[in-house]
Protein backbone atom coordinates (compact mmCIF):
# COMPACT_ATOMS: atom_id res chain seq x y z
CA UNK A 1 0.00 0.00 0.00
CA UNK A 2 1.06 3.56 -0.66
CA UNK A 3 0.94 5.78 2.40
CA UNK A 4 -0.04 9.29 1.36
CA UNK A 5 -1.94 12.24 2.73
CA UNK A 6 -1.32 14.97 5.28
CA UNK A 7 0.60 14.44 8.49
CA UNK A 8 -2.68 13.74 10.26
CA UNK A 9 -3.49 10.94 7.83
CA UNK A 10 -5.32 8.18 9.73
CA UNK A 11 -3.56 5.36 7.94
CA UNK A 12 -2.49 3.89 4.60
CA UNK A 13 -4.40 5.08 1.55
CA UNK A 14 -5.26 2.53 -1.17
CA UNK A 15 -2.97 3.00 -4.20
CA UNK A 16 -5.88 3.89 -6.49
CA UNK A 17 -6.96 6.62 -4.08
CA UNK A 18 -3.41 7.92 -3.75
CA UNK A 19 -3.03 8.12 -7.53
CA UNK A 20 -6.42 9.80 -7.91
CA UNK A 21 -5.42 12.39 -5.27
CA UNK A 22 -2.16 13.12 -7.09
CA UNK A 23 -4.09 13.53 -10.35
CA UNK A 24 -6.54 15.85 -8.57
CA UNK A 25 -3.69 18.01 -7.33
CA UNK A 26 -2.14 18.26 -10.80
CA UNK A 27 -5.55 19.14 -12.25
CA UNK A 28 -5.87 21.90 -9.62
CA UNK A 29 -2.49 23.27 -10.65
CA UNK A 30 -3.36 23.34 -14.35
CA UNK A 31 -6.79 24.86 -13.69
CA UNK A 32 -5.61 27.56 -11.30
CA UNK A 33 -2.64 28.61 -13.36
CA UNK A 34 -2.87 32.37 -13.93
CA UNK A 35 0.71 33.66 -14.14
CA UNK A 36 3.46 31.34 -15.41
CA UNK A 37 3.75 28.43 -13.00
CA UNK A 38 6.73 28.82 -10.66
CA UNK A 39 7.70 32.00 -12.55
CA UNK A 40 8.47 29.92 -15.63
CA UNK A 41 11.14 27.83 -13.88
CA UNK A 42 12.72 25.12 -16.00
CA UNK A 43 13.19 21.50 -14.90
CA UNK A 44 14.76 18.41 -16.42
CA UNK A 45 12.39 16.42 -18.59
CA UNK A 46 11.97 12.77 -17.55
CA UNK A 47 11.20 9.46 -19.19
CA UNK A 48 7.69 8.49 -18.14
CA UNK A 49 8.51 4.86 -17.40
CA UNK A 50 9.02 2.67 -14.34
CA UNK A 51 10.57 4.71 -11.56
CA UNK A 52 9.19 7.94 -12.94
CA UNK A 53 7.70 9.02 -9.58
CA UNK A 54 11.18 9.37 -8.09
CA UNK A 55 12.48 10.96 -11.27
CA UNK A 56 9.59 13.46 -11.25
CA UNK A 57 10.32 14.31 -7.64
CA UNK A 58 14.04 14.68 -8.37
CA UNK A 59 13.18 17.19 -11.09
CA UNK A 60 10.60 19.17 -9.15
CA UNK A 61 12.54 19.26 -5.88
CA UNK A 62 15.06 21.56 -7.54
CA UNK A 63 12.35 24.21 -7.88
CA UNK A 64 12.40 26.27 -4.70
CA UNK A 65 10.08 29.00 -3.48
CA UNK A 66 7.11 27.78 -5.52
CA UNK A 67 4.19 27.11 -3.19
CA UNK A 68 1.99 25.91 -6.07
CA UNK A 69 3.91 22.64 -6.39
CA UNK A 70 4.79 21.99 -2.74
CA UNK A 71 1.85 19.64 -2.24
CA UNK A 72 2.75 17.79 -5.45
CA UNK A 73 6.32 17.38 -4.17
CA UNK A 74 5.01 15.92 -0.90
CA UNK A 75 2.63 13.58 -2.69
CA UNK A 76 5.30 12.35 -5.08
CA UNK A 77 7.54 11.55 -2.11
CA UNK A 78 4.85 9.11 -0.98
CA UNK A 79 5.24 7.20 -4.26
CA UNK A 80 9.04 7.20 -4.18
CA UNK A 81 10.59 4.50 -1.97
CA UNK A 82 13.81 6.43 -1.27
CA UNK A 83 14.56 9.87 0.09
CA UNK A 84 15.12 12.48 -2.59
CA UNK A 85 17.09 15.67 -2.11
CA UNK A 86 17.91 18.61 -4.37
CA UNK A 87 20.68 17.98 -6.88
CA UNK A 88 19.96 14.24 -7.08
CA UNK A 89 19.48 12.80 -10.59
CA UNK A 90 18.50 9.41 -11.89
CA UNK A 91 19.02 7.82 -15.28
CA UNK A 92 15.38 8.60 -16.06
CA UNK A 93 16.14 12.28 -16.62
CA UNK A 94 16.51 13.43 -20.20
CA UNK A 95 19.53 15.46 -19.16
CA UNK A 96 19.78 17.48 -22.37
CA UNK A 97 16.16 18.67 -22.22
CA UNK A 98 14.72 21.24 -19.86
CA UNK A 99 11.07 22.23 -19.98
CA UNK A 100 8.88 24.67 -18.08
CA UNK A 101 7.29 23.37 -14.89
CA UNK A 102 3.84 23.95 -16.43
CA UNK A 103 4.64 21.63 -19.36
CA UNK A 104 6.23 19.11 -16.99
CA UNK A 105 3.04 19.05 -14.90
CA UNK A 106 0.87 18.70 -18.01
CA UNK A 107 2.91 15.76 -19.35
CA UNK A 108 2.97 14.07 -15.96
CA UNK A 109 -0.78 14.56 -15.54
CA UNK A 110 -1.59 12.89 -18.86
CA UNK A 111 0.69 9.95 -18.07
CA UNK A 112 -0.85 9.48 -14.62
CA UNK A 113 -4.34 9.54 -16.12
CA UNK A 114 -3.31 6.76 -18.48
CA UNK A 115 -1.91 4.76 -15.57
CA UNK A 116 -5.16 5.26 -13.68
CA UNK A 117 -7.16 4.12 -16.72
CA UNK A 118 -4.97 1.02 -16.98
CA UNK A 119 -5.18 0.22 -13.27
CA UNK A 120 -1.44 0.67 -12.68
CA UNK A 121 -1.35 2.32 -9.27
CA UNK A 122 2.11 1.52 -7.92
Amino acid sequence: LTCLGGFASPGPVPPSTALRELIEELVNITQNQKAPLCNGSMVWSINLTAGMYCAALESLINVSGCSAIEKTQRMLSGFCPHKVSAGQFSSLHVRDTKIEVAQFVKDLLLHLKKLFREGQFN
Epitope: V27, L110, K114, R117
Partner: antibody, heavy 125, light 112 residues
Framework: QVQLVQSGAEVKKPGSSVKVSCKAS????????MHWVRQAPGQGLEWMGT????????KYVPKFQGRVTITADESTSTAYMELSSLRSEDTAVYYC??????????????????WGQGTLVTVSS | DVLMTQSPGTLSLSPGERATLSCRSS???????????LEWYQQKPGQAPKLLIY???DRFSGVPDRFSGSGSGTDFTLTISRLEPEDFAVYYC?????????FGQGTKLEIK
Protein backbone atom coordinates in the same frame (compact mmCIF):
# COMPACT_ATOMS: atom_id res chain seq x y z
CA GLN B 1 -10.69 20.07 -36.32
CA VAL B 2 -10.21 16.48 -35.24
CA GLN B 3 -9.94 14.04 -38.14
CA LEU B 4 -8.87 10.45 -38.66
CA VAL B 5 -8.26 9.61 -42.31
CA GLN B 6 -7.68 5.98 -43.24
CA SER B 7 -5.96 4.43 -46.24
CA GLY B 8 -7.95 3.10 -49.18
CA ALA B 9 -9.67 -0.22 -49.80
CA GLU B 10 -7.51 -3.31 -50.28
CA VAL B 11 -8.01 -6.67 -52.00
CA LYS B 12 -5.73 -9.38 -50.68
CA LYS B 13 -5.02 -13.06 -51.27
CA PRO B 14 -5.45 -15.61 -48.47
CA GLY B 15 -2.22 -16.03 -46.51
CA SER B 16 -0.97 -12.53 -47.28
CA SER B 17 -0.82 -9.46 -45.02
CA VAL B 18 -2.46 -6.05 -45.05
CA LYS B 19 -1.37 -2.82 -43.38
CA VAL B 20 -4.00 -0.13 -42.87
CA SER B 21 -3.01 3.40 -41.90
CA CYS B 22 -4.87 6.05 -39.93
CA LYS B 23 -3.61 9.63 -40.19
CA ALA B 24 -4.63 11.89 -37.32
CA SER B 25 -4.99 15.65 -37.42
CA UNK B 26 -6.29 18.27 -35.01
CA UNK B 27 -4.71 16.62 -31.95
CA UNK B 28 -1.49 14.97 -30.73
CA UNK B 29 -1.68 11.20 -30.94
CA UNK B 30 0.67 10.85 -27.95
CA UNK B 31 -2.15 12.27 -25.82
CA UNK B 32 -4.47 9.43 -26.82
CA UNK B 33 -5.03 5.75 -27.17
CA MET B 34 -5.56 4.61 -30.75
CA HIS B 35 -7.88 1.65 -31.28
CA TRP B 36 -8.74 -0.66 -34.13
CA VAL B 37 -12.22 -2.11 -34.56
CA ARG B 38 -13.49 -4.23 -37.41
CA GLN B 39 -16.89 -5.07 -38.84
CA ALA B 40 -17.50 -8.02 -41.16
CA PRO B 41 -20.24 -7.54 -43.79
CA GLY B 42 -23.66 -7.45 -42.11
CA GLN B 43 -22.10 -8.20 -38.72
CA GLY B 44 -21.44 -6.31 -35.50
CA LEU B 45 -18.41 -4.43 -34.23
CA GLU B 46 -15.33 -6.27 -32.97
CA TRP B 47 -12.58 -4.55 -30.97
CA MET B 48 -9.15 -5.76 -32.08
CA GLY B 49 -6.69 -3.87 -29.95
CA THR B 50 -5.21 -0.55 -28.91
CA UNK B 51 -1.92 1.31 -28.63
CA UNK B 52 -0.65 4.09 -26.41
CA UNK B 53 1.42 6.06 -28.96
CA UNK B 54 3.36 7.80 -26.17
CA UNK B 55 5.16 4.58 -25.27
CA UNK B 56 4.12 1.95 -27.83
CA UNK B 57 2.28 -0.20 -25.28
CA UNK B 58 -0.35 -2.38 -26.93
CA LYS B 59 -3.30 -4.53 -25.93
CA TYR B 60 -4.72 -7.15 -28.29
CA VAL B 61 -7.69 -9.49 -28.33
CA PRO B 62 -6.25 -12.98 -27.77
CA LYS B 63 -7.88 -14.35 -30.97
CA PHE B 64 -5.73 -11.90 -32.99
CA GLN B 65 -2.55 -12.28 -30.92
CA GLY B 66 0.37 -13.13 -33.16
CA ARG B 67 -1.52 -12.10 -36.30
CA VAL B 68 -2.14 -8.42 -35.58
CA THR B 69 0.41 -5.68 -34.98
CA ILE B 70 -0.64 -2.16 -34.02
CA THR B 71 1.99 0.56 -34.27
CA ALA B 72 2.05 4.34 -34.19
CA ASP B 73 4.40 6.96 -35.58
CA GLU B 74 4.28 10.12 -33.50
CA SER B 75 6.29 12.10 -36.05
CA THR B 76 3.65 11.61 -38.75
CA SER B 77 0.64 11.35 -36.39
CA THR B 78 -0.23 8.01 -37.94
CA ALA B 79 -1.42 4.73 -36.45
CA TYR B 80 -1.13 1.43 -38.29
CA MET B 81 -2.79 -1.95 -38.05
CA GLU B 82 -1.14 -4.91 -39.79
CA LEU B 83 -2.97 -8.22 -40.03
CA SER B 84 -1.12 -11.25 -41.34
CA SER B 85 -2.06 -14.76 -42.50
CA LEU B 86 -5.27 -13.39 -43.94
CA ARG B 87 -8.28 -15.65 -44.46
CA SER B 88 -11.64 -15.05 -46.07
CA GLU B 89 -13.28 -14.38 -42.70
CA ASP B 90 -11.00 -11.35 -42.26
CA THR B 91 -12.99 -9.60 -44.99
CA ALA B 92 -14.33 -6.57 -43.14
CA VAL B 93 -14.33 -2.82 -42.77
CA TYR B 94 -11.50 -1.84 -40.42
CA TYR B 95 -11.90 1.33 -38.36
CA CYS B 96 -9.42 3.29 -36.30
CA UNK B 97 -10.67 5.34 -33.38
CA UNK B 98 -9.12 7.44 -30.65
CA UNK B 99 -9.66 7.93 -26.92
CA UNK B 100 -8.46 11.15 -25.34
CA UNK B 101 -8.28 13.05 -22.06
CA UNK B 102 -8.42 16.75 -21.26
CA UNK B 103 -6.40 18.63 -18.66
CA UNK B 104 -9.30 19.94 -16.65
CA UNK B 105 -11.00 16.93 -15.10
CA UNK B 106 -9.69 14.26 -12.82
CA UNK B 107 -11.32 11.41 -14.63
CA UNK B 108 -12.19 12.26 -18.20
CA UNK B 109 -11.57 9.22 -20.35
CA UNK B 110 -13.68 9.89 -23.42
CA UNK B 111 -14.04 6.38 -24.85
CA UNK B 112 -13.78 6.12 -28.66
CA UNK B 113 -14.93 9.63 -29.46
CA UNK B 114 -13.67 10.05 -33.03
CA TRP B 115 -13.49 7.38 -35.72
CA GLY B 116 -11.90 7.04 -39.13
CA GLN B 117 -14.08 6.55 -42.19
CA GLY B 118 -13.24 2.84 -42.39
CA THR B 119 -11.14 0.76 -44.78
CA LEU B 120 -12.65 -2.21 -46.59
CA VAL B 121 -10.28 -5.16 -46.75
CA THR B 122 -11.43 -7.97 -49.01
CA VAL B 123 -9.69 -11.33 -48.79
CA SER B 124 -10.33 -13.45 -51.83
CA SER B 125 -8.47 -15.93 -53.96
CA ASP C 1 -13.63 -12.64 -22.01
CA VAL C 2 -16.59 -10.55 -20.93
CA LEU C 3 -19.63 -11.38 -23.04
CA MET C 4 -21.95 -8.43 -23.69
CA THR C 5 -25.51 -9.44 -24.54
CA GLN C 6 -27.95 -6.90 -25.93
CA SER C 7 -31.71 -7.19 -26.08
CA PRO C 8 -33.88 -7.06 -27.99
CA GLY C 9 -32.12 -7.86 -31.24
CA THR C 10 -34.57 -5.63 -33.10
CA LEU C 11 -36.85 -2.97 -31.68
CA SER C 12 -39.69 -1.60 -33.81
CA LEU C 13 -41.06 1.75 -32.65
CA SER C 14 -42.56 4.94 -34.03
CA PRO C 15 -41.12 8.47 -33.88
CA GLY C 16 -42.11 10.14 -30.62
CA GLU C 17 -42.08 6.88 -28.65
CA ARG C 18 -39.66 5.96 -25.88
CA ALA C 19 -36.96 3.37 -26.61
CA THR C 20 -35.34 1.21 -23.96
CA LEU C 21 -32.32 -0.85 -25.01
CA SER C 22 -30.77 -3.37 -22.66
CA CYS C 23 -27.20 -4.60 -22.29
CA ARG C 24 -26.04 -7.30 -19.88
CA SER C 25 -22.44 -8.28 -19.16
CA SER C 26 -21.40 -11.82 -18.25
CA UNK C 27 -19.50 -10.49 -15.23
CA UNK C 28 -19.23 -7.33 -13.20
CA UNK C 29 -17.49 -4.65 -15.26
CA UNK C 30 -16.30 -2.34 -12.53
CA UNK C 31 -12.69 -1.49 -13.33
CA UNK C 32 -10.01 -1.89 -10.67
CA UNK C 33 -9.92 1.92 -10.42
CA UNK C 34 -13.58 2.02 -9.41
CA UNK C 35 -15.01 3.28 -12.70
CA UNK C 36 -17.31 1.33 -14.97
CA UNK C 37 -16.27 1.81 -18.58
CA LEU C 38 -19.60 1.00 -20.21
CA GLU C 39 -20.25 2.86 -23.44
CA TRP C 40 -22.98 3.14 -26.07
CA TYR C 41 -22.38 3.71 -29.77
CA GLN C 42 -24.80 4.47 -32.59
CA GLN C 43 -24.15 3.30 -36.14
CA LYS C 44 -26.05 4.11 -39.30
CA PRO C 45 -25.64 2.16 -42.57
CA GLY C 46 -22.40 2.96 -44.38
CA GLN C 47 -21.13 5.15 -41.54
CA ALA C 48 -18.61 4.80 -38.75
CA PRO C 49 -20.01 4.37 -35.23
CA LYS C 50 -20.60 7.44 -33.07
CA LEU C 51 -20.06 7.70 -29.33
CA LEU C 52 -23.22 8.53 -27.38
CA ILE C 53 -22.61 7.62 -23.75
CA TYR C 54 -19.48 6.79 -21.73
CA UNK C 55 -18.99 5.56 -18.16
CA UNK C 56 -22.59 4.29 -18.00
CA UNK C 57 -24.34 7.66 -18.01
CA ASP C 58 -22.05 10.48 -19.17
CA ARG C 59 -23.38 11.99 -22.39
CA PHE C 60 -20.73 12.81 -24.95
CA SER C 61 -20.59 16.41 -26.11
CA GLY C 62 -23.12 17.23 -28.82
CA VAL C 63 -25.32 14.23 -28.03
CA PRO C 64 -28.97 15.31 -27.54
CA ASP C 65 -30.31 15.02 -24.00
CA ARG C 66 -33.03 12.63 -25.11
CA PHE C 67 -30.28 9.97 -24.89
CA SER C 68 -29.53 8.73 -21.38
CA GLY C 69 -27.68 5.79 -19.89
CA SER C 70 -28.16 3.99 -16.60
CA GLY C 71 -27.31 0.78 -14.78
CA SER C 72 -24.60 -0.79 -12.64
CA GLY C 73 -22.68 -4.01 -12.16
CA THR C 74 -23.89 -6.21 -15.01
CA ASP C 75 -27.15 -4.58 -16.19
CA PHE C 76 -27.21 -1.42 -18.29
CA THR C 77 -29.81 0.53 -20.22
CA LEU C 78 -29.82 3.11 -22.99
CA THR C 79 -33.01 5.15 -23.07
CA ILE C 80 -34.13 7.45 -25.87
CA SER C 81 -36.95 9.49 -24.37
CA ARG C 82 -38.66 10.63 -27.59
CA LEU C 83 -37.56 9.03 -30.82
CA GLU C 84 -36.63 11.33 -33.69
CA PRO C 85 -36.45 10.04 -37.28
CA GLU C 86 -32.64 10.26 -37.21
CA ASP C 87 -32.43 7.94 -34.18
CA PHE C 88 -33.28 4.81 -36.16
CA ALA C 89 -29.97 2.96 -36.35
CA VAL C 90 -28.04 0.11 -34.74
CA TYR C 91 -26.87 0.62 -31.14
CA TYR C 92 -23.93 -1.18 -29.57
CA CYS C 93 -22.89 -1.37 -25.93
CA UNK C 94 -19.21 -1.78 -25.18
CA UNK C 95 -17.18 -2.57 -22.09
CA UNK C 96 -13.69 -1.14 -21.69
CA UNK C 97 -13.08 -2.32 -18.14
CA UNK C 98 -11.57 -5.76 -18.69
CA UNK C 99 -9.21 -6.67 -21.53
CA UNK C 100 -10.13 -7.82 -24.08
CA UNK C 101 -12.66 -5.03 -24.42
CA UNK C 102 -15.86 -6.24 -26.03
CA PHE C 103 -18.94 -5.02 -27.89
CA GLY C 104 -22.46 -6.34 -27.63
CA GLN C 105 -23.97 -7.82 -30.78
CA GLY C 106 -26.11 -4.73 -31.34
CA THR C 107 -29.77 -3.73 -31.23
CA LYS C 108 -31.39 -2.57 -34.45
CA LEU C 109 -33.89 0.22 -33.83
CA GLU C 110 -36.27 0.34 -36.77
CA ILE C 111 -39.32 2.38 -37.72
CA LYS C 112 -42.59 0.59 -37.01
Amino acid sequence: QVQLVQSGAEVKKPGSSVKVSCKASGFYIKDTYMHWVRQAPGQGLEWMGTIDPANGNTKYVPKFQGRVTITADESTSTAYMELSSLRSEDTAVYYCARSIYDDYHVDDYYAMDYWGQGTLVTVSS
Amino acid sequence: DVLMTQSPGTLSLSPGERATLSCRSSQNIVHINGNTYLEWYQQKPGQAPKLLIYKISDRFSGVPDRFSGSGSGTDFTLTISRLEPEDFAVYYCFQGSHVPWTFGQGTKLEIK
